[in-house]
């Protein structure tokens, strides 16, 4: 059975075998099509999610469509019915947690009272000022936070305490790529770790441990990506696996925040990589042990510069490394995360290609994760 | 695009009162305060008091407590400030002004174009 | 009621100069502070909240510093339309209260 099962796919009505590489191959070879039902899925970007979180104390803003113009939620009336639509319209299906929190002086967006119509926010019409000079803080799920926080080294191995989002992507057993957790049913990642295999049996996810072999692996129900664009083959390396069965988080198994839409990182902003990728370049071994570095973000204009990567960094993509080289991610660290830390860790960005490893003008770039958050929310949604 | 359009001047006597208006346009009128400032001949801005538009509550400098009154009428998107007892100090050019976000402490932004009011005898 | 103090009530300078004016409050106002601009005859026009914070369609030549009890606003280099009469204010409580002017003149 193992080994019919590793190399053969069974069809049903009539029940027959046909050789697992015809699977997602684009190709209906079973009567019924099943075999390009579980395969890796494209998602167009979609519209835009008319509520959003901001990195000011996590304070929800809401977009008046007629005017395509962002407003801050005022406190004034709301309830836990809203902070559950405004979570729900960002795909979040567990319970919110929501608080007052001042007007600072530099507010600068205007203020309004929300309301709901058709389960999605709306400014209240006939409103008038915001009395409690007050703003909504949201927070649509607990998140980025660790037993443990890192000492800031070089390259170090890592416990799971410190980083309990992270997971191990694997196909057939094998360690292929990193994932993150962000919430009981979603693990983030980067599409091209499922260039090679489009099918979604043989996926599985390990979370829970530092160590490569030693946790118990989850079975995947869907496998998500963006639509290719070949203008920028580059972009778009994110990818979002849907587990078959929600996690149970504990001390080892807790999500990290997504950022927030305005988390604009400045150059030499301290990051973090976590990975089990190759410890050298070429050197052709994955690490048995996670590993854990501290980064810094590195200025784009740096990063597209002649002797770098000539323009190849786009808007949607970040770098980041450490100026005299060295430190980076590497083969196998692929689609693990770039981390920030302010209250809590988020994912900034995902590990997504490089030149080399460690070179001083090549650092890694990354998939910069504000930039998707839209197409996250979409997705989410869908799939509530 | 937002527009305060105030009244005109007005000459009164020591002791009469004077009424002034500030008609809003372009934008939803009872989602913001608006304040009434005045300027003296050649002198400085002294804040008088705010009005919140939705609700009719209103606030005042102590110097003008028991003087003044603001009221604003919604179907006309209109507000008003009455000063009585005129004293020749009293003239000034007398300023509405809307502020810049739908909360209290946000500066003022938009101005009327003003309103000269003389208290001579 | 907090006073505002600005220095100098006047001063005279030239096209392309850089021009500081200092406003100080009798207690703290955090970045509680506005600026504005007024020309004779004319409303008052906002050129600058939360202390440093410049108003959307402002020209960034103006620029605003400062938090606690000191601020300053900063022309970097003077225009012939910036010849007129500016103005701090203080937010964080009632009744609002604004400095006594400065007058820019042309030297």
């Known amino acids: 059975k193992v080994i019919l099962d590793k190399y053969y796919f069974l069809c049903g009505q009539p029940l027959h075998f046909i050789p697992r590489k015809q699977l997602c191959d684009g190709e209906l070879d079973c009567p019924l099509g099943e075999d390009e039902e579980h395969c890796v899925k494209s998602f167009p970007e979609g519209p835009a999610v008319a509520v959003r979180l901001s990195k000011d104390r996590s304070t929800l803003q809401v977009l008046d469509s007629a005017t395509g113009n962002w407003f801050s939620a005022c406190f004034d009336n709301f309830t836990e019915a809203l902070a559950e639509t405004a979570c729900r319209q960002m795909g979040y299906s567990s319970k919110p947690t929501f608080r007052a929190v001042e007007i600072g002086p530099d507010q600068d967006l205007d203020v309004v009272e929300i309301t709901e119509n058709s389960q999605e926010l709306r400014m209240r019409n006939s409103s008038g000022p915001c009395l409690s000079g007050s703003l909504v803080s949201l927070h649509c799920l607990a998140c980025g936070k660790s037993l443990k926080t890192p000492r800031v080294v070089g390259v170090e191995e890592a416990s799971v305490d410190s980083w309990p989002w992270q997971v191990s992507i694997q196909y057939d057993k094998q360690h292929v790529c990193g994932g993150s957790i962000l919430d009981p049913h979603w693990v983030l990642t980067a599409a091209h770790c499922f260039r090679k295999h489009t099918d979604v049996f043989n996926w599985k996810v390990r979370a829970g441990s530092d160590k490569l072999g030693s946790f118990p692996s989850l079975a995947v129900a869907k496998i998500i990506i963006i639509e290719f664009n070949p203008m920028y083959p580059k972009d778009n390396d994110i990818a979002l696996m849907k587990l078959q069965f929600p996690l149970t988080f504990s001390g080892t198994v807790r999500p990290i925040c997504l950022p927030f839409f305005d988390e604009e990182l400045t150059p030499a902003t301290p990051l973090w990589i976590i990975g089990w990728g190759f410890t050298k370049q070429n050197g052709g071994k994955m690490s048995d042990i996670l590993l854990q570095a501290s980064v810094q973000v590195i200025d784009s204009t740096r990063c597209n510069a002649d002797d770098a990567y000539q323009g190849e960094v786009t808007e949607k993509m970040m770098c980041a490394g450490i100026p005299e080289g060295g430190v980076d991610t590497c083969q196998g660290d692929s689609g693990g995360p770039l981390m920030y830390q302010s209250d809590q860790w988020h994912v900034v960005g995902i590990v997504s290609w490089g030149y080399g490893c460690g070179g001083p003008s090549t650092p890694g770039v990354y998939t910069k994760v504000s930039a998707y958050l839209n197409w996250i929310y979409n997705v989410w949604k869908a799939e509530l | 695009q937002v527009q305060l359009v105030q009244s005109g001047a007005e000459v009164k006597k020591p002791g009469a009162s004077v009424k002034v208006s500030c008609k809003a346009s372009g934008y939803t009128f009872t989602r913001y305060y608006m304040h009434w400032v005045r300027q003296a001949p050649g002198q400085g801005l002294e804040w008088m008091g705010w009005i919140n538009p939705n609700s009719g509550v209103t606030n005042f400098a102590q110097k003008f407590q028991g003087r003044v009154t603001m009221t604003r009428d919604t179907s006309t998107s209109t507000v008003y400030m009455e000063l009585s007892s005129l004293r020749s100090e009293d003239t000034a050019v007398y300023y509405c002004?809307?502020?810049?976000?739908?909360?209290?402490?946000?500066?003022?932004?938009?101005w009327g174009q003003g309103t000269l009011v003389t208290v001579s005898s | 009621d907090i006073q505002m103090t600005q220095s100098p009530s006047s001063l005279s300078a030239s096209v392309g100069d850089r021009v500081t004016i200092t406003c100080r409050a009798s207690?703290?106002?955090?970045?509680?502070l506005a600026w504005y601009q007024q020309k004779p005859g004319k409303a008052p026009k906002l050129l600058i909240y939360?202390?440093?914070s410049l108003q959307s369609g402002v020209p960034s030549r103006f620029s605003g510093s400062g938090s606690g009890t000191d601020f300053t606003l900063t022309i970097s280099s003077l225009q012939p339309e910036d010849f007129a009469t500016y103005y701090c204010q203080q937010a964080i409580s009632f009744p609002l209260t604004f400095g006594g002017g400065t007058k820019v003149e042309i030297k």
């Open positions: 002004a809307r502020v810049r976000i739908g909360w209290l402490q946000s500066p003022p932004l938009y």
């Open positions: 207690q703290s106002i955090n970045t509680w």
């Open positions: 939360a202390a440093s």
